[in-house]
């Protein structure tokens, strides 16, 4: 990629001096901070990305930009200015001696620097045998525009662009921002190089193989033949979709990213930027059988992060790696042994593998679904693309025992139609990260800008928590969760639901004086209650158990431990209508579930009593579950004694409004 | 399952050339970059050379460079190393390794062969 | 001439825990991944833990790795009989463009 900011790309020994004078401290009380990737291997020392605060205008990027060049030379220091960011990010991109950061966090405007580090293609390579395309199979649905409104923008290796499967469906264009190969003696074949691009093309939108055989595609190459690329490359790249975007707006935009790297601020933070600008953005989990929080941008919270499963529903293996999993995946894909277009020549097939694979899959779904309906938002799509995903099919097994409970067991499929979905409230389980085990350790889980929060749960595998509750935070309602002393930490666990037109508070009631526990209730004339949570102070809640059946006719309560403040989600919406369901078992049971009849929405899931040997509560798709300590170590019957409290919602308006455009 | 068997061991006097083969099945062999690792006897284990997946890239010790050659030949799943000027110190037991990873093949090795036996002696 | 060292053995009781080091330099342990291998005898190497402290699945949570600067450290609790074996660190060097293992280590069990 060729810097459209010339001017920079000189190295510089030395500036107008009057350049000197520009030094000013940053802005009081802000400490500008330093990240670089987990991973030592993966890290690029000597290239940085500075980052600037959000409203920094060009100018004064470029300014900033020559004022680190002016006095790294009157310390003798050259330095490059690589490119300058605007548009997505305020910044720019310094190659520089890794001692001229302490100067560089000094300078105004400045808000972090990251150093530059590697991304990575996420298939396994290719396998040798040539292979047949399938045949379209008649009971799929196949809409009849395909995802021709929407365009798809790949950010991966180049591609043979005169693939049979992908032939005029694909616009290469002009970008090209890739490292060198490694090794001494690496020949540039064009068909390796060609190779993980044109698969995933052809798994989007390829005319036999291809999920939306209509969409169009543009692609921008940010790996090399190597299938590796930089944080840095893939930035400018995210930017120049921006730019172009700006220039010339058309249809909804999807963006795959079917790369991984480690975790970065900056790739999360641009993803950020665009998704939040309208964009679609689908990323590959990983392939390290991980963790894919510890991963960019599988790990940004407005990216759709796709997991890879097998034809037996089973997470893909990779050799000892495999599949990421954890909170930051939002579903999983097919992603092992799919056949699409391979480089070796224009009418070949071949057969790859990984979560890049997965991500084309949802990449594909996601334009058929905007192809149908345009104005979906981000928010829309992601709680659509759940919705449809086939459930509870995938062995958990093979994840860690403590990724289990965190990561969604949920496979894409296409949706039975693309229209008739719009009556449906739909709510997704949002998990936080953990808390970290010390005494006053705090996990906070946020739904989308466009999500309302219905429900907080909390969930601690020691059962030493202080529960949760819901609070405003820079105009938005969070869920927040409380370790207890001695306790391994805690996860707030949200319900982020689309509610459009939603009025939604938070009413508290004290710990009760007397011995009937705590309740509160929703009183405003048409607020109905969509979620309880329940938050104490003292270290270990005793046994009390408030009386498990509300009293009748008052469905709007939330009722809990007497030591306890508890917490009513009050929410009014045009046609919104809840009602609460319970399941309570007398004998110890390690784990109770209540579920939600068809047609009705789980908003809210919270367990009956509120004491300790209570793990916590949470939503699996339309399921409460509140989960218990080990039988064996809970002490009496009466004891182990545990309720599960779901709160189911429809939506009448949303019927109505569908039935309308039927 | 996965395998790896190494063949091709034998005994050969110094100067002599010797080429061993390692058989690679239950996996996609194409897909992983493959390492040789040899252990004379009663010492530790020392590597020896790199191949990349594909066959691009090959890395070797500074005690073999010149005089081992490691290939592969992704359509018969087989490794090999072509080891020639063969010395005394060259004797060990020959491991072939799959690297973890094809693009981060500095991970490390997750499954070995059993061995073949090389032995340089006049 | 082995580039990690390790120290050549480590003995303790079964149930109890030992610690084996692995030192070096930045361009192997300080910039790259670390992998440890159990050799039982008479038989081939096996991975133990990747990634500096990931274990492939089979490999019991007694196994641990860490690793702080230029060295890294694998733990094993819970000691048992059948874990006496040659341990080996491993790592890419950046400056040999090579991999590198550490000189072994061997545990005893008391």
């Known amino acids: 990629q060729e810097d459209e900011d010339g001017d920079y790309e000189e190295l510089v020994l030395a500036l107008r001096s009057e350049e000197d004078g520009l030094a000013e401290a940053p802005e009081h009380g802000t400490t500008a901070t330093f990240h670089r990737c987990a991973k030592d291997p993966w890290r690029l020392p000597g290239t940085y990305v500075v980052v600037l605060k959000e409203e920094t205008h060009l100018s004064q990027s470029e300014r900033t930009a020559r004022r680190l060049q002016a006095q790294a030379a009157r310390r003798g220091y050259l330095t490059k200015i690589l490119h300058v960011f605007h548009g997505l990010l305020p910044g720019f991109l310094v190659k520089m001696s890794g001692d001229l950061l302490e100067l560089a966090l000094k300078l105004p405007h400045v808000d972090y620097i990251e150093e530059d580090s590697s991304v990575f293609a996420q298939s396994i390579p290719w396998n040798l045998e040539r292979i047949t395309p399938p045949r379209y199979r008649a009971d799929e649905y196949q809409p009849p525009d395909g995802g021709s409104l929407v365009e798809v923008y790949l950010l991966d290796t180049s591609i043979q662009s005169d693939h049979r499967e992908i032939e005029g469906r694909v616009m290469v264009t002009d970008f090209e921002n890739v490292p060198e190969e490694d090794g001494t003696r690496f020949h540039r074949q064009a068909s390796k190089c060609d190779s993980h691009g044109t698969h995933l093309a052809g798994v989007v939108s390829g005319r036999d193989a291809g999920v939306a055989k209509g969409a169009s595609m543009r692609s921008l190459r940010v790996l090399n033949c190597q299938g590796k690329g930089t944080v840095s490359g893939t930035l400018i790249g995210l930017e120049f979709i921006r730019k172009s975007q700006l220039v010339q707006p058309v249809g909804p935009l999807v963006v795959l990213l079917p790369l991984a790297g480690g975790y970065s601020r900056v790739l999360n933070a641009a993803c950020q930027r665009l998704a939040r600008a309208g964009v679609v953005l689908v990323t590959a989990a990983g392939n390290f059988r991980d963790d894919a929080c510890l991963y960019s941008p599988a790990s940004a919270p407005e990216v759709i992060t796709v997991g890879a499963t097998n034809a037996q529903d089973q997470p893909v293996t990779l050799g000892t790696l495999g599949t990421n999993f954890g909170r930051c995946v939002d579903l999983f894909a097919p992603g092992e042994d799919i056949i699409g277009a391979s480089s070796d020549c224009s009418t070949c097939f071949v057969s790859q593998s990984g979560t890049s694979q997965a991500a084309a899959h949802v990449a594909g779904i996601a334009a058929m679904m905007l192809s149908a309906e345009p104005e979906l938002t981000l928010a829309e799509l992601r709680q659509r693309l759940i919705h449809f995903s086939a459930k509870d099919v995938i062995n958990e097994a093979w994840f860690p025992e403590d990724q289990r409970v965190l990561t969604p067991n949920l496979v894409a499929a296409l949706p039975p139609s693309t229209h008739g979905a719009g009556w449906q409230l739909f709510c997704r389980t949002v998990w936080s990260a953990h808390s970290g085990p010390t005494r006053m350790a705090t996990a906070v889980a946020r739904c989308a800008p466009d999500e309302e929060l219905l429900s907080c749960s909390s969930f601690s595998r020691s059962g030493k928590r202080r529960g949760e509750r819901m609070e405003a935070q820079g105009g938005k309602l969070v869920c927040r969760a409380h370790n207890a002393f001695g306790g391994e930490g805690v996860y707030a666990i949200a319900r982020c639901c689309l509610l459009p037109q939603a009025n939604c508070s938070v009413h508290t009631a004290p710990p009760a004086e007397a011995s009937m526990g705590t309740r509160v209730h929703c009183h405003q004339q048409g607020h109905v209650l969509t979620g309880c949570s329940s938050h104490w102070e003292v270290e270990d809640l005793g046994t009390h158990k408030p009386p498990v059946l509300r009293p009748r006719g008052q469905p709007n309560q939330c009722v809990g431990h007497r030591e306890a403040s508890i917490h009513a989600s009050c929410c009014h919406a045009p046609g919104l209508e809840c009602k609460v369901k319970e399941h309570g078992i007398p004998a110890p049971q390690e784990q109770v579930t209540v579920a939600c009849e068809e047609g009705w929405t789980l908003t809210g899931c919270s367990a009956l009593p509120g004491t300790s040997h209570v793990l916590g509560a949470y939503a699996v798709d339309n399921t409460c579950v509140v989960r218990s300590r080990d039988v064996s170590t809970t002490g009496s019957t009466s004891e182990g004694a545990v309720t599960a409290v779901a709160i189911c919602c429809r939506s009448r308006h949303l019927a109505q409004a569908s039935q309308e455009l039927q | 399952q996965v395998q790896l068997v190494e063949s091709g061991g034998g005994v050969v006097q110094p100067g002599r050339s010797l080429r061993l083969s390692c058989a690679a099945s239950?996996?996609?062999?194409?897909?992983?970059?493959m390492h040789w690792v040899r252990q004379a006897p009663g010492k530790g284990l020392e590597w020896v050379a790199l191949?990349?997946?594909?066959?691009?890239?090959?890395y070797y010790a500074d005690s073999v460079k010149g005089r081992f050659t490691i290939s592969r030949d992704n359509s018969k799943n087989t490794l090999y190393l072509q080891m020639n000027s063969l010395r005394a110190e060259d004797t060990a037991v020959y491991y072939c390794?799959?690297?973890?990873?094809?693009?981060?093949?500095?991970?490390?090795?997750?499954?070995w062969g059993h061995g073949t036996t090389v032995t340089v002696s006049s | 001439q082995s580039v990690l060292t390790q120290p050549p053995s480590v003995s303790a009781a079964p149930g109890q825990k030992v610690t084996i080091s692995c030192s070096g330099s930045?361009?192997?342990?300080?910039?790259?991944?670390v992998s440890w291998y159990q050799q039982l005898p008479g038989t081939a190497p096996k991975l133990l833990i990747y990634?500096?402290?990931k274990r492939p699945s089979g490999i019991p949570d007694r196994f641990s790795g860490s690793k702080s600067g230029t060295s890294a450290t694998l733990g094993i609790t819970g000691l048992q009989t059948g874990d006496e074996a040659d341990y080996y660190c491993?790592?890419?060097?950046?400056?040999?463009?090579?991999?590198?293992f550490g000189t072994g280590t061997r545990v005893t069990v008391l």
């Open positions: 390794a799959r690297a973890i990873a094809a693009l981060y093949y500095y991970y490390g090795m997750d499954v």
């Open positions: 191949i990349w997946n594909d066959g691009s890239n090959k």
């Open positions: 239950g996996f996609t062999f194409s897909s992983f970059g």
């Open positions: 491993g790592t890419w060097d950046s400056s040999l463009s090579g991999y590198v």
């Open positions: 990634d500096y402290n």
């Open positions: 930045s361009s192997n342990i300080g910039n790259n991944f």
